[in-house]
C-alpha cells in the first residue's frame, strides 16, 4: 500500500538535487581560490540538515545556520549589486564587470540559483513530486526561507554605494513584496551604506520616459530616506548598449546617455 504523501501546489525538488548542489560547489570552489578550503561534502551535509525530515512549511532561518557558517564568504562590501525581477541582466552585468557581485555570484547563491527543494516531515526522503508554493501553501518553505536568509545577510554586508537593478517593464518597478523590497531594503545598514543607487532598466527601444519618477520608485526613495540612506536613480534606456559599454567603455558611442 503506497504511503500517503502531502501534495503541494508548487513544483517538486529539482531532479538530481544533491548531485547538482555538490557539482556546483566543486565547480565554484575550483574557480574561486578564496573558497578552496570549503569541503563540499560538509556543505551538502549542512544543506540536507536544513530541510530533510522537517515539515516543509515549518522551516526557520535557524535551520540554515550551519550552512550559512560553512558558506561564509567576504565580498567587497562596496561592490554589491542587488536586483529585482531582472536577474538575467544583473548576472550578465557582473559577468562583464567582474569586480561587482550579485548574491548568485557568492557560493551559497550560486549553489541554489534556480533550484527547488523540500523534504517531508519525519522521513529522510527528498520530495521530488511537489513542494510548497509561497502564495498557495506557506511562506516558511525551504526555498523561501533560504533566499530570505542569504538575502538578509548579503544586504547586511553591503557598504558605501549599493546598486540595485530594477525592471522598468513591470507594473511595479519597485515591489514591496519582492525579496529586494521585503528583505534587502530593510537590512541595509545606515551606518555603513551611504547611498542606494537604482538603475531602472527600460524594456522598449523607444521608451524615453523618466522612470525614476515612477510612483513606486518614489516609494522606494521614501523608505530609503527614512532609513537615513541617500537615494539616487538612473534610467538605463538601452540595456543592450549599456552592457556593450561596460565591455568596451572606450567606444565612442558610450559617451552619450544609455
Amino acid at each position: 500500500v503506497p504511503r500517503w504523501r502531502q501534495q503541494w501546489s508548487g513544483p517538486g525538488t529539482t531532479k538530481r538535487f544533491p548531485e547538482t548542489v555538490l557539482a556546483r560547489c566543486v565547480k565554484y570552489t575550483e574557480i574561486h581560490p578564496e573558497m578552496r578550503h570549503v569541503d563540499c561534502q560538509s556543505v551538502w551535509d549542512a544543506f540536507k540538515g536544513a530541510f530533510i525530515s522537517k515539515h516543509p512549511c515549518n522551516i526557520t532561518e535557524e535551520d540554515y545556520q550551519p550552512l550559512m557558517k560553512l558558506g561564509t564568504q567576504t565580498v567587497p562590501c562596496n561592490k554589491i549589486l542587488l536586483w529585482s525581477r531582472i536577474k538575467d541582466l544583473a548576472h550578465q552585468f557582473t559577468q562583464v564587470q567582474r569586480d561587482m557581485f550579485t548574491l548568485e555570484d557568492t557560493l551559497l547563491g550560486y549553489l541554489a540559483d534556480d533550484l527547488t527543494w523540500c523534504g517531508e516531515f519525519n522521513t529522510s526522503k527528498i520530495n521530488y513530486q511537489s513542494c510548497p508554493d509561497w502564495r498557495k501553501d506557506c511562506s516558511n518553505n525551504p526555498v523561501s526561507v533560504f533566499w530570505k536568509t542569504v538575502s538578509r545577510r548579503f544586504a547586511e554586508a553591503a557598504c558605501d554605494v549599493v546598486h540595485v537593478m530594477l525592471n522598468g517593464s513591470r507594473s511595479k518597478i519597485f515591489d514591496k513584496n519582492s525579496t529586494f523590497g521585503s528583505v534587502e531594503v530593510h537590512n541595509l545598514q545606515p551606518e555603513k551604506v551611504q547611498t542606494l543607487e537604482a538603475w531602472v532598466i527600460h524594456g522598449g527601444r523607444e521608451d524615453s520616459r523618466d522612470l525614476c519618477q515612477d510612483p513606486t520608485i518614489k516609494e522606494l526613495e521614501s523608505i530609503i530616506s527614512k532609513r537615513n540612506i541617500q537615494f539616487s536613480c538612473k534610467n538605463i534606456y538601452r540595456p543592450d548598449k549599456f552592457l556593450q559599454c561596460v565591455k568596451n567603455p572606450e567606444d565612442s558611442s558610450c559617451t552619450s546617455e544609455i
Epitope: 555538490l22 551535509d45 540538515g49 530533510i52
Partner: antibody, heavy 120, light 107 residues
C-alpha cells in the same frame, strides 16, 4: 546483487605505504559514494574518509589528513584508499562501505575487509 | 567532532529477552543515526537508518527510536543469531563517527 570486493591482506613495514582497492559490481558505481572504515584488533569502527566518484572529490577525518588519499576509478568501478607513513597502530582491518551520494542513508553495503599488518 | 557514546559496553541476555542499547551524541544530530550489527570476523551489517527506519530484510524485532542527542536500539525478543556487537553511527556531519560498540553475549 551488489558486491564490494576488496584486495587481499597486506604486511607492511613501518614508514611504508599501502593501497587497498574496493571493486563494486551490481550497481551504478557513479550513483554512490564510498567510505573507508577501519577496525583495529579488538577495537571499534573508525571512519577514515569518503569519495564521490562522479565528482572525483574526497574528504577525510582530520586524524588522517596528509596521510590518506582516497580516490576512485570510474572506468573500473573501483575505489582506493592509500595510507602512507604506516606505523604499528595502523594494523587493522580496512573496510570499504557504500552509501548514497546525498548521504541520506547508512552504509548499506560493505566489503569483506582487508587486513593490513604493520610490523618490522 | 561529534562523540557517540553507547551504553552499556556489554550485556548478557537470554534468548527471548527484550534488549535495549542506548546511544548519546555530544551534540544534536537530528535523526541522522544508523545502527549496525557486527559478528566476529565479519563486516558490519546495517539494521536501522534515520534513527527509526528498518533496513530492508532486517527482522521486525529490531527497532530504533530517538532524535537530537538520545537514541535507542531495541531487540524485542532476542534470538540466537542476534548475539553480536552493535554500533551506532552519526551521519549528520563529517567526520562520521561511531559509538564504541555494545557486545551482546549469551547469559
Amino acid at each position: 546483487q551488489v558486491q564490494l570486493v576488496q584486495s587481499g591482506a597486506e604486511v607492511k613495514k613501518p614508514g611504508s605505504s599501502v593501497k587497498v582497492s574496493c571493486k563494486a559490481s551490481g550497481g551504478t558505481f557513479s550513483s554512490y559514494a564510498f567510505s573507508w572504515v577501519r577496525q583495529a584488533p579488538g577495537q571499534g569502527l573508525e571512519w577514515m574518509g569518503r569519495v564521490i566518484p562522479f565528482l572525483g572529490i574526497a574528504n577525510s577525518a582530520q586524524k588522517f589528513q596528509g596521510r590518506v588519499t582516497i580516490t576512485a576509478d570510474k572506468s573500473t568501478s573501483t575505489a582506493y584508499m592509500d595510507l602512507s607513513s604506516l606505523r604499528s597502530e595502523d594494523t587493522a582491518v580496512y573496510y570499504c562501505a557504500r552509501d548514497d551520494i546525498a548521504a541520506l542513508g547508512p552504509f548499506d553495503y560493505w566489503g569483506q575487509g582487508t587486513l593490513v599488518t604493520v610490523s618490522s | 567532532d561529534i562523540q557517540m557514546t553507547q551504553s552499556p559496553s556489554s550485556l548478557s541476555a537470554s534468548v527471548g529477552d527484550r534488549v535495549t542499547i542506548t546511544c548519546r551524541a555530544s551534540q544534536g544530530i537530528s535523526s541522522w543515526l544508523a545502527w549496525y550489527q557486527q559478528k566476529p570476523e565479519k563486516a558490519p551489517k546495517s539494521l536501522i537508518y534515520a534513527a527509526s527506519s528498518l533496513q530492508s530484510g532486517v527482522p521486525s524485532r529490531f527497532s530504533g527510536s530517538g532524535s537530537g542527542t538520545d537514541f535507542t536500539l531495541t531487540i524485542s525478543s532476542l534470538q540466537p543469531e542476534d548475539f553480536a556487537t552493535y554500533y551506532c553511527q552519526q551521519y549528520n556531519s563529517y567526520p562520521r563517527t561511531f559509538g564504541q560498540g555494545t557486545k551482546v553475549e549469551i547469559k
